[in-house]
């Protein structure tokens, strides 16, 4: 079952798939001046197995303006990048995917696609979130979000993040400095930290992992 | 069970200080911001100060600024509210509040007069 | 003066159906925060009774519910009660103060 909306947004904030659910599909987009070849696919689909999941179907872009169909780029279980809707950025950590049975990596990038991905994420998806550069989360470890079915609709959960903007740290005379993020997890946590600078997360953790002192209650 | 207990309150005169200190128990402290939350005799809510949950930064109420420093220690579970220059207007109940805030303490008062 | 407006009272008989209303701004509420809801029973500490606009934490009657839309939100009771005879508070991060506003609070009675 597809989810009917889009993954909340967050303000000062993105967030990223750290795998896909089989049934995702993700639009062959070409970027400015190409278009996708005719009898090209419209989408990729998450496939799979009992044992193995991998997008089916291939996105290939060619120019607008001439007939010369680009190099096809097949895809492969590879890398982690972006998300929907936003501008494609470094590689994130693999998954190791062994531990996410029935679902999908990140696809590969095929030339000339468009620098923003769209998904259409199933039911049971989740999604991480981080704060944007130039702002800091005020609660510690991941935000996530997961599409969920209720009385036959479909919604995602709010993620708890709040951004801050970093202009003001108030350090009046004589004030300590502040503490350092701890080294190590505290007891009940994984070893997982989630700040503007670290979203190297292990899916497979972080679902166990506090967003809102309560959410895991709540949701 | 999540709670957070305030302490510190007092009778103070004008121009003095107050350290209030607010004990957690129950949930990761180390993990969530924490807030300053006062409420006056009869009035409503005001938020007065917060903390990232690594202490790294801080923000203040324009009413407190200058005057009241956040600060927490992760090792002790344990937050603080260092009131300084206490003015009438000061007088309340102050709760610390932890997260969205989720969860609240039952406040401690703080009373400022000559 | 409160940044997110509330009605100062509200009221109605046990079994109706009430609404409380909370308007804010693009620095709050319209930029996309989250609003929570607290309701505050006479000498006790608020408690949190709707959680990211229309959330409910475990142990709060669904007779509960929040909405939000725009600049503004709502809380609804229905079955209204003797024990809801409280005040509640709205409130949302806000992104010029970097600190959560309230609402100045509703006092709902129940006749």
């Known amino acids: 079952e597809l989810c009917d909306d889009d993954p909340p947004e967050i303000p000062h904030a993105t967030f990223k798939a750290m795998a896909y659910k089989e049934g995702t599909m993700l639009n062959c987009e070409c970027k400015r001046g190409f278009r996708r070849i005719k009898s090209g696919s419209l989408y990729m689909l998450c496939t799979g197995n009992s044992s193995h999941s991998s997008w089916d179907n291939q996105c290939q872009c060619t120019s607008s303006a001439t007939r010369n169909t680009t190099k096809q780029v097949t895809p492969q279980p590879e890398e982690q990048k972006e998300r929907k809707t936003t501008e494609m950025q470094s590689p994130m950590q693999p998954v190791d995917q062994a531990s996410l049975p029935g679902h999908c990596r990140e696809p590969p990038p095929w030339e000339n696609e468009a620098t923003e991905r769209i998904y259409h994420f199933v039911v049971g998806q989740m999604v991480y979130y981080q704060c944007v550069q130039g702002y800091r989360a005020l609660h510690r470890g991941p935000a996530e979000s997961v599409c969920k079915m209720t009385h036959g609709k479909t919604r995602w959960t709010q993620p708890q993040l709040i951004c801050t903007g970093e202009m003001e740290t108030s350090q009046f005379p004589g004030e300590e400095k502040p503490q350092a993020s701890p080294e190590g997890r505290p007891e009940s946590e994984t070893s997982c930290l989630v700040t503007t600078t670290d979203f190297q997360i292990q899916t497979e953790m972080a679902a166990t992992m506090e967003t809102s002192i309560f959410t895991t209650e709540y949701q | 069970e999540v709670q957070l207990l305030e302490s510190g309150g007092g009778l103070v005169q004008p121009g003095g200080s107050l350290r209030l200190s607010c004990a957690a128990s129950?949930?990761?402290?180390?993990?969530?911001?924490m807030h300053w939350v006062r409420q006056a005799p009869g009035k409503g809510l005001e938020w007065v100060s917060v903390?990232?949950?690594?202490?790294?930064?801080?923000y203040y109420a324009d009413s407190v600024k200058g005057r009241f420093t956040i600060s927490r220690d992760n090792s002790k579970n344990t937050l603080y509210l260092q009131m300084n220059s206490l003015r009438a207007e000061d007088t309340a109940v102050y709760y610390c509040?932890?997260?969205?805030?989720?969860?609240w303490g039952q406040g401690t008062l703080v009373t400022v007069s000559s | 003066q409160s940044v997110l407006t509330q009605p100062p009272s509200a009221s109605g008989t046990p079994g109706q159906r009430v609404t409380i209303s909370c308007t804010g701004s693009?620095?709050?509420?319209?930029?996309?925060?989250?609003v929570h809801w607290y309701q505050q029973l006479p000498g006790t500490a608020p408690k949190l009774l709707i959680y990211?606009?229309?959330e409910r934490p475990s142990g709060v009657p669904d007779r509960f519910s929040g909405s939000k839309s725009g600049t503004s939100a709502s809380l609804a009771i229905s079955g209204l009660r003797s024990e809801d005879e409280a005040d509640y508070y709205c409130a949302a991060w806000d992104n010029s103060l970097n600190g959560p506003v309230f609402g100045g609070g509703t006092k709902l009675t129940v006749l």
């Open positions: 129950g949930f990761t402290f180390s993990s969530y911001g």
């Open positions: 990211s606009n229309n």
């Open positions: 903390i990232s949950y690594d202490g790294s930064y801080k």
């Open positions: 693009s620095s709050n509420i319209g930029a996309g925060y989250d």
């Open positions: 509040a932890a997260g969205v805030p989720d969860y």
